[in-house]
Interface confidence: low
């Protein structure tokens, strides 16, 4: 599984993280987890192994099985949302996962991230620095 090393977005804004996986994992459960340690992070939202999107309060997840990419969106960002998160795939044995650092810029601070042309408050990251975990 691959994803961006870090993502940055403004306070009160939203961000989208895209996590890519290899062929064969299409119908597995995908999840988004918070916490510095992989083995103790807390799952915030997950798919049901289908392409049906799921939304929970300020976070949503959607799996595009054709492109083998699942997308996580966090809205209404607060400063204390800044943390280490993980994109993951549930499987028998250890899950697959990759770490994503979420940085939230305080309101009024200049943001260096590229913004989507349709919404100046949303930053989309596919990640130029990709890495594999596990």
């Amino acid at each position: 599984i691959q994803g961006p090393e870090s993502v940055r977005a403004p306070e009160q804004g939203s961000l989208t993280v895209q996590c890519h996986y290899k062929q064969g994992w299409e119908t597995y459960i995908k999840w988004w987890c918070r916490g510095v340690r992989w083995d103790t992070c807390k799952i915030l939202i997950e798919t049901r192994g289908s392409e049906q999107g799921e939304k929970s309060d300020r976070v949503s997840i959607k799996d595009n099985q054709k492109d083998r990419t699942f997308t996580v969106t966090m809205e209404g960002l607060r400063r204390d949302d800044a943390d280490v998160y993980w994109c993951g795939i549930e499987r028998r044995g250890p899950d697959l996962g990759t770490q994503v650092k979420v940085i939230v810029d305080p309101e009024g601070a200049a943001s260096t991230t590229a913004s989507s042309p349709t919404n100046s408050n949303m930053a989309v990251f596919i990640g130029s620095h990709k890495r594999n975990h596990y």
């Epitope: 103790t40 807390k42 607060r78």
Partner: antibody
Framework: QVQLVQSGAEVKKPGASVKVSCKAS????????VHWVRQAPGQGLEWMGI????????NYAQKFQGRVTMTRDTSTSTVYMELSSLRSEDTAVYYC???????????????????WGQGTTVTVSS | DIQMTQSPSSLSASVGDRVTITCRAS??????LNWYQQKPGKAPKLLIY???TLQSGVPSRFSGSGSGTDFTLTISSLQPEDFATYYC?????????FGQGTKVEIK
Amino acid sequence: QVQLVQSGAEVKKPGASVKVSCKASGYTFTTYAVHWVRQAPGQGLEWMGIVNPNSGGTNYAQKFQGRVTMTRDTSTSTVYMELSSLRSEDTAVYYCARDIVPMNNFYNYYYGMDVWGQGTTVTVSS
Amino acid sequence: DIQMTQSPSSLSASVGDRVTITCRASQSISSYLNWYQQKPGKAPKLLIYATSTLQSGVPSRFSGSGSGTDFTLTISSLQPEDFATYYCQQSYRIPYTFGQGTKVEIK
């Protein structure tokens, strides 16, 4: 003191809906998420879902998806749980319970239930 | 969904006994495990959260341990007011499932 006070017992016919209220006092209503848990007679506890009183955002157990609606009214510090298409298996005591972790500390991060309502008995019978 | 299995489902003990209740999760839940006590006709009461953190006002004779899939609630010296049903609950993954309960009865 911190407390959750629920509405009174209800008797409903199969197919009907029931709406249970849970009024919070003694703390900042919008700071803590509220869970709903039910317990059928002589049975264990079953988690139904959670509502964020600040945003109104919800997350339901798949089992109740499509039948349950959890809402809140910040002006009265009250959360509501409405269950539709009632059947006899829905006969239970329904509890609201406050999450132990203030929501401004974490993002979508629910822990456990430290303050409980007294429970509302819902009986479904023809 | 994550299945939570408690054992035993019931036990008989005397005042002063050391009582241990175990809870097993169908998959790893890290340390996101809570314990509740419920008496007949009453709402549950939180005893321990995050595996081992004692909720405010709960006597120190209650303790919790474990991680991953296996957890334990221990009552070091059973008191008359401890006769009740105990439930474990995981808060790792929605839906936040409970164990089936362990009833602690007087021997």
